[in-house]
């Protein structure tokens, strides 16, 4: 029954979607952004305990004009899932509870078999989400690859499919800057560089504050970070523009310490106006 | 950026509203941006290692506008925008590190002081 006039069950199981998702709530998932290649998902390693894998399987005729050719009932329809060491099976969810398949995994949760129906009827379509634990992902993990294989005892040639995600470690650093003041004025008389004794001789004062905040783990485990400021010290013809008097880093060194940046500013060794600090 | 006058359409700026502006407003046409990224200025990069960076750090940089250059080069200019840029870089053996929003642009507006008469 369900195998057409020739009594041979020629199914057409297709894995039409296999994409990684972020789990928003128990049954709500959001697809991960895609890499520029359009086929690889981007997974940010930033404390997500699980990742979802959205799977959509259909059993529809390959040619709607010749529906009798295939798309028959798929008996003992299954999806076999092979997980990498970095991912472990943790559960299955479906938007429609009636579509939720029975999924069983081996002892170390690296291999999963999901029963899609016996049979998975002609015209059927099922969407569900595998919930995969990310606890095995380390900073050395660069890619996630899950191998997926549909299986049935009905007549159909089936080939493995891979779902891929590129893993990156997103440093949750934010940077913001302000100038004090936001507007400057120039006036007076032209004076040569050698006439400058004190910073007050140079022109209007300006202070820049650049704040960096780290919402994640300490950077010590990941490498060394640098805060850089591109300081426009001269105009295109080589004349001074903004003269750098003092550069100090606060908070990147430990309590109360002021970090040293390179190169050193105030190369003309002008007298510092301490009232401005 | 800050404008001394009322707000205008983007790209249009006015000098501070003083009737005795040293250069006539007809002459004061240009709005110039001095920005190393556009090649209109040259930059020195101050680089500060964040040795024990757990939560936050603030870079404080004090500077002075080089008055003489502005008097010589820009006294007939309507307004100048000076751009300072800052970013974070991370050196790591980890290949798949990614920084998002790791740069910022800080503009400052510069005008000929309307309160002062320029001495030649």
């Amino acid at each position: 029954q369900g195998c057409g006039e020739d009594k041979i069950c020629q199914s057409n199981l297709q894995l039409v979607r296999a994409r990684f998702c972020t789990r928003v709530s128990d049954t709500e998932f959001q697809p991960l952004p895609m890499d520029v290649d359009g086929t690889t998902a981007l997974f940010a390693l930033s404390g997500q305990p699980v990742i979802g894998l959205e799977l959509m399987v259909t059993n529809l005729p390959s040619d709607p004009a010749q529906p009798q050719a295939d798309g028959d009932d798929a008996h003992e329809a299954q999806l076999l899932v092979m997980l990498p060491d970095s991912l472990h099976y943790s559960g299955v969810r479906a938007l429609d509870p009636a579509e939720k398949p029975l999924c069983l995994s081996n002892e170390n949760a690296s291999h999963v078999e999901c029963e899609l129906g016996n049979p998975m009827k002609r015209g059927a379509q099922v969407t569900f989400y595998l919930i995969l634990s990310t606890s095995g992902i380390s900073i050395e993990t660069t890619e996630l690859e899950v191998e997926l294989l549909l299986a049935t005892i009905s007549e159909q040639e089936l080939h493995p499919v891979s779902a891929r995600a590129r893993v990156f470690i997103e440093l949750p650093l934010s940077i913001a800057g302000m100038a004090i003041p936001q507007q400057l004025f120039f006036s007076g008389v032209v004076r040569g560089e050698r006439a400058m004794q004190s910073e007050r001789d140079v022109g209007s004062k300006v202070k820049y504050e650049v704040t960096v905040s780290n919402q994640g783990q300490s950077l010590r485990t990941l490498g060394s970070a640098f805060l850089n400021i591109m300081w426009p010290h001269e105009i295109a013809n080589g004349k001074w523009l903004l003269y750098p008097m003092q550069v100090e880093l606060e908070g990147g060194q430990g309590p109360g310490q002021k970090g040293l940046c390179s190169p050193r500013p105030n190369i003309l060794h002008l007298d510092v106006d301490s009232r401005d600090r | 950026e800050l404008e001394p006058p009322e707000q205008q359409e983007p790209g249009e700026r006015q000098e501070p509203s003083m009737s005795w502006w040293p250069v006539s407003s007809a002459e004061k046409k240009k709005n110039i941006t001095l920005d190393c990224a556009r090649g209109t200025a040259n930059c020195v990069v101050f680089s500060c290692p964040l040795y024990s960076f757990d939560r936050a750090a603030v870079l404080h940089v004090w500077g002075r506008l080089w008055n003489s250059t502005f008097l010589e080069e820009y006294s007939a200019v309507k307004s100048l925008e000076v751009i300072v840029r800052a970013n974070i870089t991370v050196k790591s053996s980890i290949k798949n590190l990614m920084l998002r929003d790791a740069s910022t642009v800080i503009p400052v507006m510069v005008y000929l002081d309307p309160m002062a008469v320029v001495a030649e």
Partner: antibody
Framework: EVQLVESGGGLVKPGGSLRLSCAAS????????MNWVRQAPGKGLEWVSS????????YYADSLKGRFTISRDNAKNSLYLQMNSLRAEDTAVYYC????????????WGQGTMVTVSS | SSELTQDPAVSVALGQTVRITCQGD??????ASWYQQKPGQAPVLVIY???NRPSGIPDRFSGSSSGNTASLTITGAQAEDEADFYC???????????FGGGTKLTVL
């Protein structure tokens, strides 16, 4: 929820001392310059003091003449104001306020704590 | 130290437009920020920078700047806008903050 809660206000005699505290929650306290602002009864707002992220840069209103000391404990997410040699004119509601990173603006304020200096 | 001057009181008819001004030498160099304070409550930031509104502040509030004067404009004033409004900026030293004396807005 981003919140600042002041405490430590009360009645104190002229010449006395008081230490105000401000407990921060809901944000990375150590990333922000913090301020104290006060408001005498029926009067306007007056800036008192500011402290940078780890306390390297501290500023006070000129009128305070070294009687007040601002400090912070980032491990406890707390801001403090030690007030000595108090005078009747220091009677006010004292607010702690967070300064936005990229602007000179106080975007988060506490509800204030009342300090009354009276004999 | 710098001073910022505000009109002590301003009134506006319901639904009309009102402008509150703030004058001071430091405003030639610094943006003003504006705060609304209702009786018994802490101040609330309404405008900062060139003309930025924090989230939750209605778009009837706007800011502008000209010379040494900053202005807060409320277009279509509502009854709930009745409050004291304060401007602030840094003083000319760049290290201190100065507040204006405040403007009491009455919505008629």
């Amino acid at each position: 929820e981003v919140q600042l809660v002041e405490s430590g206000g009360g009645l104190v005699k002229p010449g006395g001392s008081l230490r105000l505290s401000c407990a921060a929650s809901g944000f990375t306290f150590s990333s922000y310059t913090m301020n104290w602002v006060r408001q005498a009864p029926g009067k306007g707002l007056e800036w008192v003091s500011s402290i940078s992220i780890v306390g390297n840069y501290i500023y006070y209103a000129d009128s305070l003449k070294g009687r007040f000391t601002i400090s912070r404990d980032n491990a406890k997410n707390s801001l403090y104001l030690q007030m000595n040699s108090l005078r009747a004119e220091d009677t006010a509601v004292y607010y702690c306020a967070r300064r936005k990173w990229e602007h000179d603006a106080f975007d988060i304020w506490g509800q204030g704590t009342m300090v009354t200096v009276s004999s | 130290s710098s001073e910022l001057t505000q009109d002590p009181a301003v009134s506006v008819a319901l639904g009309q437009t009102v402008r509150i001004t703030c004058q001071g030498d430091s405003l030639r160099s610094y943006y003003a920020s504006w705060y609304q304070q209702k009786p018994g409550q802490a101040p609330v930031l309404v405008i900062y920078g060139k003309n930025n509104r924090p989230s939750g502040i209605p778009d009837r509030f706007s800011g502008s700047s000209s010379g040494n004067t900053a202005s807060l404009t409320i277009t279509g004033a509502q009854a709930e806008d009745e409050a004291d409004f304060y401007c602030t900026s840094r003083d000319n030293s760049g290290n201190h903050v100065v507040f204006g004396g405040g403007t009491k807005l009455t919505v008629l």
